[in-house]
Amino acid sequence: APTSSSTKKTQLQLEHLLLDLQMILNGINNYKNPKLTRMLTFKFYMPKKATELKHLQCLEEELKPLEEVLNLAQSKNFHLRPRDLISNINVIVLELKGSETTFMCEYADETATIVEFLNRWITFCQSIISTLT
């Protein structure tokens, strides 16, 4: 059974994941982002179901494509490079879903834009956090 300290740790990790996903979305949604139109042409796979931590496998499998799209920003100055963000997200995702469990991700038939993709995983984090508090 999960202890209160392990629940607290899970909640904190989910909050950190949520914050970085939101920040990426902030950057993409920035109306001054000249690469937004190009970014929106890339398609992401969405999970058929995302209600448990094991479903983060579906996010993990899309992190490389996400990094590639973020690299399109090609800012002359990154505070955080896409690889810094994706590396941190990957560490959090691995800790949350556990590396022992082998879960085969099932994807929805319809693909999504980067904005829809990020919003889906932001909603996932918020939903799981709400069950922990």
């Epitope: 949520l18 996903l21 920040m23 920035n30 920003a73 800012s75 955080l80 963000l85 941190n88």
Partner: nanobody, 119 residues
């Protein structure tokens, strides 16, 4: 509008340590990047280190292994622990706040704090 208040600069001998702090207040996004940049006389401003509210970090190659950036999300404060300081670390250190991972004109900058490394 975001206000940034820096502290912790000063004069230190080579090999010494300093800890910089920067507190942000005002219209703060919960998801943001805070970081430190520096500008030495006659040189361009350069990134030292940055950290997101989710814990993602980026360090300049020249400070890796010597400087550590951390933050307290509850206090909207970022810290830069600087160890094994070298004369070439001498510069004005500026705190930065951004709502995105890349620099743009919506970013906010502190007034700067002087760090001098000299014997």
């Amino acid at each position: 509008e975001v206000q940034l208040v820096e502290s912790g600069g000063g004069l230190v001998q080579p090999g010494g340590s300093l800890r910089l702090s920067c507190a942000a207040s005002g219209s703060i996004f919960s998801s943001n990047v805070m970081g430190w940049y520096r500008q030495a006389p006659g040189k361009q401003r350069e990134l030292v280190a940055a950290i997101s509210s989710g814990g993602s970090t980026n360090y300049a190659d020249s400070v890796k292994g010597r400087f550590t950036i951390s933050r307290d999300n509850a206090k909207n404060t970022v810290y830069l622990q600087m160890n094994s300081l070298k004369p070439e670390d001498t510069a004005v250190y500026y705190c930065a706040y951004a709502s995105s991972f890349y620099e743009d004109e919506t970013d906010y900058w502190g007034q700067g704090t002087q760090v001098t490394v000299s014997s």
